[in-house]
Each structure stands twice: as structure tokens, then as C-alpha cells.
């Protein structure tokens, strides 16, 4: 008789693929527009992305350190009117996009909590969950909790409020902290809490301590969903060089949990690059022409318009990776296992039941090396082949599709493989 | 049981004032939002604001911002609507309506459980 089929988890639209966070509606747009009328003609583009969710915003009135005029049920009008928004939240959910409201209360001041008036903002926020439910958001973000005092007891509260309305309802926060025993602590209380932090931006781009990370982080955590990303809020290209954006966006997408990326991520927009242009918000450069400021700074390679066209770009590695992760269910919600592969090397196994299953190789090096796959770390259930077929590289020049016998490895400097093979019982 | 009386309401000149107050008895409303609609003779029944529970956050139609405030005593069981500035086209018949579910009423009238008879406000230019 055939195995029993393993009984499929229980999977929440946020587990199905990646996030994508809109801190900057005016960045985002470019050329003086930035606004929601404006954003609901960019969801084409988030649908081809293949993302679930849009983190959007804050986009509520907020006049710098004032309490009085911060009002998280008013948009702020530069942004657009509450028609707008509504507008918006019904075309998102024709095209299967979640949104995600960030409701951060001071996001223009110094203290993004009002440190003198928590328990003001933290009421004002409990209602502003409420009103905005019921206008039909998917869930919320609230950034830089660190500065929340008593954070663990009101997000309890908030999410006790976004759960009791639906149990498909998401609550989100960000924190700047890498610190594992705290982002542990702040997790603890909240059991369906979606945390993003700084916990991997400091990975010292090596194997090894990437490896070390996450296999920490995955066991500290036990069974609990994750989610993924370098930061609470900005650009891979704040912590990465050019050379590891790829191989992070094979690693993000294939690591049990949720992806969150911040816009331009997928094409690696550098502020670094564009002079004048504010770290954590610069302009997304949809063609040659959204950064005028510096006649010739932007190639069409560094553009969306550029790379669409380019089968070999970054743009191009995120879509193909995005559509894998959201239809595969060894990448869905498979097992983990991460294995020794020899030094500079990542690797593991994401497997489900008799599903095909995926072997991931990252080598975080500058130099090109021989992987050693010790199948010796991996128990029974996550035994590997001699050969597994190539999905796909980071780097071109492979033939994808061909078999690749995993004794004799080699991966080029900061190449990242993605492998399939089936299941054998 | 939630059992909702307006009273307040009246005939004024345009660019005048009025305060609306709504009594609400058989139970405390301190744990709901609660929400001011009004309805003019042959249209729909439209929103004007909601207060949360607190009194802490008020949301008002594009309409009557900065001319109308919502408050609530909830020791006394009541809700306020101080109209200023009234224009003719703010005539209408005003309700007050509870929304034992939520802390924070909505727009959509449908949220709320509970409904007074209404108080007439005539605005005359």
C-alpha cells in the first residue's frame, strides 16, 4: 500500500509568499505624484512580482511630535482621501493583494511612540484597528517597538483585537533590535505575531555565521511561523553589496517563513547610486527617466523597464523565485534541514511528504568552491539523491533543467543553486 | 436592550448652532462605539461621525469637518453632536446609533446594533 499522505497545515494567505512594504507612497511613484489614486495603477506591477501582500504606508495624519495632530483615522491628504483608499483596498483584492496598513504613529517625528503619552497612542491605536477592520484592510505594521514601553502587553491587546474580527487578519512589527533574547522576549507573549527585525543584517555575509543565524533562530523559535527579512524597513542594499543581492533573494524566498522585501529590492535600488537621495526612501526607478536629477546616473539596467526585459536580471530572479515559493509545497510549508556543505557554504533542505523536494546551496564567498554535501547531518526523511536537476542559478551561464551530480558540486563566487528532485520512499 | 433618545433638535438660521444629545438607557455604552447618522427628506441615511468608547478618537464625513464635534459623557450614558456654521443643506432628521461590538464605530451604517427615533434639524437660509 501507498504511505498515508501527511495531513496539510492549516496556511494563512501570509504563508502562501512574499510581503511587500510601501513605507514611501512619494518615493515610490516618483516624478511629484505619490499618492493612493497613483498606487492603484502601480498593483499590475505588485501582481507580476507575484506577492501576497502590500505593507502600506503610514499614510494617517501626523504632524511631527504632536500628539494632538495625529490622527491615525484621517489620511493625510497629500496621499489621498478615504475614498481613495477604499478604492484601492477593492482593486487589491480583485487582483488577490492583501494590504497591510502601517499605523506607526509618529512616522514623521523623533519618537515614533510619543514616549511622554503612551497610553493616549496606545488607545488611539486600538481604535484605529477597529475603524480601519472595518473598512476592510488585511492586517497592520507597527515599526520600531523598542521604543514602546510595556510593547509585549499592547500588542497582545492589538493582536487580540485584529484576531477577534478574523482569524485571516495579520498583525505585523518591526523592530531595530538584532538582538535574539529580545526579539525571543517580544515574540513570547504574541503567538501569531509577524516580527520583523535587524536579527540578520548582521550576518557578516559569511556561510557560516549566516547558517549559524538562522539555524538559531529556527530552533529558538520551534514551530512558530518566521518571517524573513534584513531589516524592519529598509533596503537590501543598506546592509548587502551588489554581489550577495541575488543569493540573499534565493535564501529569503526558500527559508521556512515570510519573505518581506521593501520596495525596489527586487531590482537592488541603491541609494548609494542615485546622489541626493535619502537612504531609507529613494525614488524607484521605473525607467531611464524617474531620476532627472543627474542626466545619465541611471542605466536602464538599474530599471525596472530594463530588467523586465532581461531574463537574466535581478527583477527576472525575483519573479521566477516568487512564483516558486508560492506554488511548491516543499517551499510552502516543508521541513528544514541545513546541513554541512564545507566552509563559505549554506545549504538545505526544504522537503514535504512525497511532494518534490529542494536543495538550496549558497556560497557567500568570493571564491569558487567545491561543495562537500555532508548527507550524514540530514535524518532519514531528507536523504539526498546523487543527482538533482537544476532549477535554477544565480548567476548565468548554467543550463537549467540539467541533472547535477551532487559528489562533484562546484559553485561559482557568490552563487546561490536552487535544486528539485522527488521524492523516493 | 440599548434604548436610544435624541433630543436637541430644532429650526435655526443658517451659520447658526445647535447641540444634539443622545440618552442612552438599559445599559452602559461605554464599551461601544457610537455613531451619528442623519437623513434628509427623499435620500439615503448618511454618516456623519463616530466617537470610540474612550471619547479618545471621532471620524466625521468630509461634510461637516471642522464645523461638527462629537463627545460623549459616559457617566451619564450620552453622546453629543455640537453642529456650528449650519448650512441649509444640513437639514435632515439626525440619529444616534450604538455599535455594541466595536469600541470604534464605522461609516457603514450596518455595523450598528442599536438606533434612536431620530431628532429633526431644520436649517433654514
Known amino acids: 500500500r501507498a504511505p498515508r499522505c501527511r495531513e496539510l497545515p492549516a496556511q494563512k494567505w501570509w504563508h502562501t509568499g512574499a510581503l511587500y512594504r510601501i513605507g514611501d507612497l512619494q518615493a515610490f511613484q516618483g516624478h511629484g505624484a505619490g499618492n493612493l489614486a497613483g498606487l492603484k495603477g502601480r498593483l499590475d506591477y505588485l501582481s507580476s512580482l507575484k506577492v501576497k501582500g502590500l505593507v502600506l504606508g503610514p499614510i494617517h495624519k501626523n504632524q511631527k511630535d504632536d500628539v494632538a495632530q495625529t490622527d491615525l483615522l484621517q489620511i493625510d491628504p497629500n496621499f489621498g482621501s478615504k475614498e481613495d483608499f477604499d478604492s484601492l483596498l477593492q482593486s487589491a483584492k480583485k487582483k488577490s493583494i492583501r494590504v497591510i496598513l502601517d499605523l506607526t504613529p509618529n512616522y514623521r517625528g523623533e519618537n515614533s511612540w510619543f514616549s511622554t503619552q503612551v497610553d493616549t497612542v496606545a488607545t488611539k491605536v486600538k481604535d484605529a484597528l477597529e475603524f480601519w477592520l472595518q473598512a476592510g484592510v488585511d492586517g497592520f505594521q507597527v515599526r520600531d517597538i523598542e521604543n514602546l514601553k510595556d510593547a509585549s502587553s499592547f500588542l497582545a491587546e492589538w493582536q487580540n483585537i485584529t484576531k477577534g474580527f478574523s482569524e485571516d487578519r495579520l498583525l505585523i512589527a518591526g523592530t531595530n533590535s538584532s538582538d535574539l533574547q529580545q526579539i525571543l522576549s517580544l515574540l513570547e507573549s504574541n503567538k501569531d505575531l509577524l516580527l520583523t527585525s535587524s536579527y540578520l543584517s548582521d550576518s557578516g555575509s559569511t556561510g557560516e555565521h549566516t547558517k549559524s543565524l538562522v539555524t538559531q533562530y529556527l530552533n529558538a523559535t520551534g514551530n512558530r511561523w518566521c518571517s524573513w527579512s534584513l531589516s524592519q524597513a529598509r533596503l537590501l542594499t543598506s546592509f548587502l553589496p551588489a554581489q550577495l543581492l541575488r543569493l540573499y533573494q534565493l535564501m529569503l524566498f526558500t527559508l521556512p517563513g515570510t519573505p518581506v522585501f521593501s520596495y525596489g529590492d527586487e531590482i537592488g535600488l541603491d541609494a548609494a547610486a542615485l546622489p541626493g537621495q535619502p537612504m531609507e526612501a529613494p525614488v524607484m526607478l521605473w525607467d531611464e527617466s524617474s531620476f532627472p536629477d543627474i542626466p545619465g546616473a541611471v542605466s536602464a539596467n538599474m530599471t525596472v523597464k530594463g530588467q523586465s526585459e532581461d531574463p537574466g536580471s535581478l527583477l527576472s530572479l525575483f519573479r521566477r523565485l516568487s512564483d516558486q515559493r508560492s506554488k511548491e509545497r516543499s517551499l510552502l510549508h516543508g521541513d528544514f534541514h541545513a546541513f554541512s556543505a564545507g566552509p563559505g557554504l549554506f545549504s538545505y533542505i526544504r522537503h514535504w511528504d512525497q511532494n518534490e523536494r529542494f536543495l538550496v546551496v549558497l556560497n557567500f564567498g568570493d571564491v569558487g568552491l567545491s561543495a562537500g554535501l555532508q548527507a550524514s547531518d540530514l535524518p532519514a526523511s531528507a536523504s539526498l539523491p546523487a543527482k538533482a536537476d537544476l532549477l535554477l542559478s544565480t548567476q548565468p551561464g548554467r543550463e537549467e533543467g540539467s541533472p547535477l551530480e551532487l559528489e562533484r558540486l562546484k559553485l561559482e563566487p557568490h552563487e546561490g543553486l536552487l535544486l528539485r528532485f522527488p521524492y523516493a520512499a | 436592550q440599548v434604548h436610544l433618545v435624541e433630543s436637541g433638535g430644532g429650526l435655526v438660521q443658517a451659520g447658526g448652532s445647535l447641540r444634539l444629545s443622545c440618552a442612552a438607557s438599559g445599559r452602559t455604552i461605554s464599551t461601544y462605539g457610537m455613531g451619528w447618522f442623519r437623513q434628509a427628506p427623499g435620500k439615503e441615511r448618511e454618516f456623519v461621525g463616530t466617537?470610540?468608547?474612550?471619547?479618545?478618537?471621532?471620524y466625521y464625513t468630509d461634510s461637516v469637518k471642522g464645523r461638527f464635534t462629537i463627545s460623549r459623557d459616559n457617566a451619564k450614558n450620552t453622546v453629543y453632536l455640537e453642529m456650528n456654521s449650519l448650512k441649509p443643506e444640513d437639514t435632515a432628521v439626525y440619529f444616534c446609533?450604538?455599535?455594541?461590538?466595536?469600541?470604534?464605530?464605522?461609516?457603514?451604517?450596518?455595523?450598528?446594533?442599536?438606533w434612536g427615533q431620530g431628532t429633526q434639524v431644520t436649517v433654514s437660509s
Open positions: 466617537i470610540s468608547c474612550s471619547g479618545t478618537s471621532t
Open positions: 446609533a450604538a455599535d455594541t461590538r466595536h469600541c470604534m464605530g464605522y461609516t457603514k451604517h450596518g455595523g450598528y446594533d442599536y
